[in-house]
Amino acid sequence: LIIGFGISGKHFITVTTFTSAGNIGEDGTLSCTFEPDIKLNGIVIQWLKEGIKGLVHEFKEGKDDLSQQHEMFRGRTAVFADQVVVGNASLRLKNVQLTDAGTYTCYIRTSKGKGNANLEYKTGAFSMPEINVDYNASSESLRCEAPRWFPQPTVAWASQVDQGANFSEVSNTSFELNSENVTMKVVSVLYNVTINNTYSCMIENDIAKATGDIKVTDSEVKRRSQLQLLNSG
């Protein structure tokens, strides 16, 4: 969370940004809020990126002004125009690229004053794992699979019954490059599993951490998977 103050004469406004992460190939959001101003025509939003000449995006007088937009962002940006009056200056970024990572500035000018704040935007790939019982193996095993990660993550297994146990000797993890030659598919197999136990497969890089849980009993199979972005907010 970054809060910036701007001073214009006696006036300043608070601008707030949140460190966020973009999943390459998908759409992302660079979050920025400011003190609302009901006078839409008096609001100017400028997004800038460190090391890039020209603007990432500009919104003024109630509409986009892309005359100074840098070509790497052409056709890929939009603000939430209907939410500007309530103080939302967040930027939607289409088809996130690895090269979109960096430091961005959200600059705001309203009739109340002006202000800006920086945000760090990380890019990579992250996805939820699917965890399944693998009957193909010679002994009952669990297969944890996640389709898109970058940079290469670490993979670890844990179990509710054997807390603190090291499963590296009884698991096998592979990384397979996807067709676009950047992201990788992660597959990890845990061998010799027992029923009535909850197992967790944890996949983590510097951007995200994903966990898949599975509990197998004689009468039911319960699965969960979740993902959290790291260092955001």
Epitope: M128, E130, N132, K215, E220, R223, R224, Q226
Partner: antibody, heavy 130, light 107 residues
């Protein structure tokens, strides 16, 4: 969005094996994230989950049918199949193939997956009678 | 297996009415519940998942709420195309089970 079409005999004799195939179009059966499911509905009654299969071969069956059910996948034909053996009149039903997919929802700490049956075939009626 | 009980099993209502259907789970399932609509001779259609998340393309007059063991599906203003049978389904674990259904008919 994937589309599903069931096929197979509409009439099966008691004690024989019911065999149905589901053909997947507008999507690959071997892409991850989908569980290929079978669900049935007895005449005028509610829905019963039979089981599903993941492209890697992992299967999950309803314990009440497990001893009689086999679900398999043929990635080369983009199809998955249901076999239910030793059928009786109680197996007369409309059989649906469906996809179970993980749909993510936002949580305070990130995202969580909810596995939901979101695409269904049109259903095929199977009658068990001699 | 987790049992789901729906109430009422039959409901008679008029266009414009607010309709509420309840589903009880035999054990706590957090928010792992979905709602489906089925019309005669057709496959069920997903309306809501995660107890309250509206599936893409479903009209906003449909809403879901609840957590744990008690869940509700609400249709804020019943439309002619809403006369159908509604099922709840838990997403908590295998085997998946469905409620017995609620048939919504024209009064």
């Amino acid at each position: 969005q994937v589309q599903l079409q069931e096929s197979g005999p509409g009439l099966v004799k008691p004690s024989q094996t019911l065999s149905l195939t589901c053909t997947v179009s507008d999507g690959s059966i071997s892409s991850g994230g989908y569980y290929w499911s079978w669900i049935r509905q007895h005449p005028g009654k509610g829905l019963e989950w039979i089981g599903n299969i993941y492209y890697s071969g992992s299967t999950y069956y309803n314990p009440s049918l497990k001893s009689r059910v086999t679900i398999s996948v043929d990635t080369s034909k983009n199809q998955f199949s249901l076999k239910l053996n030793s059928v009786t009149a109680a197996d007369t039903a409309v059989y649906y193939c469906a996809t179970e997919k993980a749909l993510a929802t936002v949580t305070p700490s990130g995202y969580e997956n909810y596995y939901t049956v979101d695409v269904w075939g049109q259903g095929t009626t199977v009658t068990v009678s001699s | 297996d987790i049992q789901l009980t729906q109430s009422p099993s039959f409901l008679s209502a008029s266009v414009g009415d607010r309709v509420t259907i309840t589903c009880w789970a035999s054990q706590g399932i957090s928010s792992y519940l979905a709602w489906y609509q089925q019309k005669p001779g057709k496959a069920p259609k997903l309306l809501i998942y995660a107890a309250s998340t509206l599936q893409s393309g479903v009209p906003s007059r449909f809403s879901g709420s609840g957590s744990g063991t008690e869940f509700t599906l609400t249709i804020s203003s019943l439309q002619p195309e809403d006369f159908a049978t509604y099922y709840c389904q838990h997403l908590n674990s295998y085997p998946l089970t469905f409620g017995g259904g609620t048939k919504v008919e024209i009064k």
